[in-house]
């Protein structure tokens, strides 16, 4: 039925649009950039991104229309709604602070919450993290007693345990919580990299051609026989 289809008979897709046959007598147009509408008959007024502040743009009869997010207004959603013009948003003498698309309450001492509608109790909930214990020191003040390994006004900061580390023989200190570990080079092992690795045990074939492996602190050596030489008696 292709030759009698509207795509061929009436060529409905304008402005260089491509016609796609959906069924015997229905079609869909894929428009060129800059055009929109069922038959690509409208100039896409949204192409210039006229809608501001995250609003959604739609084209209707060569005109754009912006659907604003909450908190914005105007033809292009360019105007911020000042929620603070309407009194009563913030309770208990809270100060209203207008923000792009929203507002915030800055509460007086003793109150908290989005609308300053809740009483502030220093340790409820506890601001102390990492297992710290909150102690109320005044009507509006608190102190956090931190577990070992943490510091900060809310115990938020890990104490670096590496400054006084005892990693030996080129061991690298890796900080933990109230502890540290030593990352040892291959020749050393143990908590502080003080124990020698016996390479002769780890590598039975370290010495070639009948050479004898001799473990040493921080390494090993080969005692070669029958005229062989070199680090591993291979020369």
């Amino acid at each position: 039925y292709s030759t009698s289809h509207p795509c061929f008979v009436s060529r409905p897709c304008l402005n260089g649009g491509t016609c796609h046959m959906l069924s015997r007598d229905t079609y869909e147009c894929t428009c060129q950039v800059g055009f929109t509408g069922k038959e690509c008959q409208w100039t896409d007024a949204c192409l210039s991104h006229p809608c501001a502040n995250g609003s959604t743009c739609t084209t209707v009869a060569n005109q754009f229309s912006c659907k604003c997010l909450t908190g914005f207004t105007g033809q292009k959603c360019e105007t911020d709604v000042n929620e603070c013009d309407i009194p009563g948003h913030c309770q208990h003498g809270g100060t209203c602070l207008n923000l792009p698309g929203s507002y915030q309450c800055q509460c007086p001492q003793g109150f908290t919450g989005q609308y300053c509608d809740s009483l502030y109790v220093p340790c409820a909930p506890s601001p102390c993290v990492n297992g710290g214990t909150c102690r109320q020191t005044g009507d509006f003040t608190f102190e956090c007693n931190c577990l070992p390994g943490f510091e900060g006004s809310t115990c938020e900061r890990n104490i670096d345990d590496c400054p006084n580390h005892r990693c030996q023989n080129g061991g690298v200190c890796v900080d933990g919580v109230n502890t540290y570990n030593c990352r040892c080079p291959p020749q050393w092992t143990g908590q502080f990299c003080t124990e020698d690795v016996d390479e002769c045990l780890l590598q039975p074939n370290a010495c070639q051609n009948g050479g004898t492996c001799a473990n040493r602190n921080g390494g090993y050596g080969c005692v070669c026989v029958n005229g062989w030489s070199g680090d591993d008696c291979s020369e």
């Epitope: 601001p127 006004s153 809310t154 938020e156 900061r157 890990n158 670096d160 900080d175």
Partner: antibody, heavy 120, light 107 residues
Framework: EVKLVDYGGGLVQPGASLRLSCEVS????????MEWIRQAPGKGLEWIAA??????????VYSASVKDRFTISRDTYKSILYLQMSTLKPEDTAVYYC???????????WGQGTSVIVSS | DIQMTQSPASLSASLGETVTIQCQTS??????LAWYHQKPGKSPQLLIY???RLQDGVPSRFTGSGSGTQYSLKISSMQTEDEGVYFC?????????FGSGTKLEIK
């Protein structure tokens, strides 16, 4: 309103000393850790010193680049944070900011900065 | 010291566009990360603390995410006032360290 005002910067010669001040208001000074941060011309931010809060006996910590040359301190009665800088070097040239540590992994209030130029 | 690797160093975006800045740390900082915005001649302003929490007074188009050693800041629908330099900073342990900054310009 939380407010921090930095002052005391200026032009000094290498080897000289200078004391920066940061006057704070709008919060309980002794409850918060306070930090000094600097920014060399056209460069990034560098932390240099901290004064812990009263609960931690106002103990101090420094970056390796200023240790033994700079001293952080505070006057809790006047609500002023200080940074005493000695043996100044040309590489100490920067804008110095004091800031309040929120206790929630962020510096939530900053001074306007005071400029220190070390040049002969 | 914990090293901070921030990328990109600079980028330009059109108004309304979404922008993402990355920050990588040399060790796990357990979400102890903050993001700041600085305009020329001004002090930095805290945007995000604790990796994902929005600071009071900061527009909700700013979103922080990440954990472990990988963190990002997303600015959805770029506005004129968003131009400037963005810094990440770890507050997990002393010394506090900052990323080298990302300069954001309007295309």
């Amino acid at each position: 309103e939380v407010k921090l005002v930095d002052y005391g910067g200026g032009l000094v010669q290498p080897g000289a000393s200078l004391r920066l001040s940061c006057e704070v208001s709008g919060f309980t000074f002794s409850d918060f850790y306070m930090e000094w941060i600097r920014q060399a011309p056209g460069k990034g931010l560098e932390w240099i010193a901290a004064s812990r809060n009263k609960a931690n006996n106002f103990s101090i910590v420094y970056s390796a680049s200023v240790k033994d040359r700079f001293t952080i301190s505070r006057d809790t009665y006047k609500s002023i944070l200080y940074l005493q800088m000695s043996t100044l070097k040309p590489e100490d040239t920067a804008v110095y900011y004091c800031s309040r540590d929120s206790g929630r992994w962020g510096l939530d209030a900053w001074g306007q900065g005071t400029s220190v130029i070390v040049s002969s | 010291d914990i090293q901070m690797t921030q990328s990109p160093a600079s980028l330009s975006a059109s108004l309304g566009e979404t922008v993402t800045i990355q920050c990588q740390t040399s060790e796990d900082i357990y979400s102890g990360l903050a993001w700041y915005h600085q305009k020329p001649g001004k002090s930095p302003q805290l945007l995000i603390y604790g990796a994902s929490r929005l600071q009071d007074g900061v527009p909700s188009r700013f979103t922080g995410s990440g954990s472990g050693t990988q963190y990002s800041l997303k600015i959805s629908s770029m506005q004129t006032e968003d131009e400037g330099v963005y810094f990440c900073q770890q507050g997990f342990k002393y010394p506090l360290t900052f990323g080298s900054g990302t300069k954001l310009e309007i295309k």
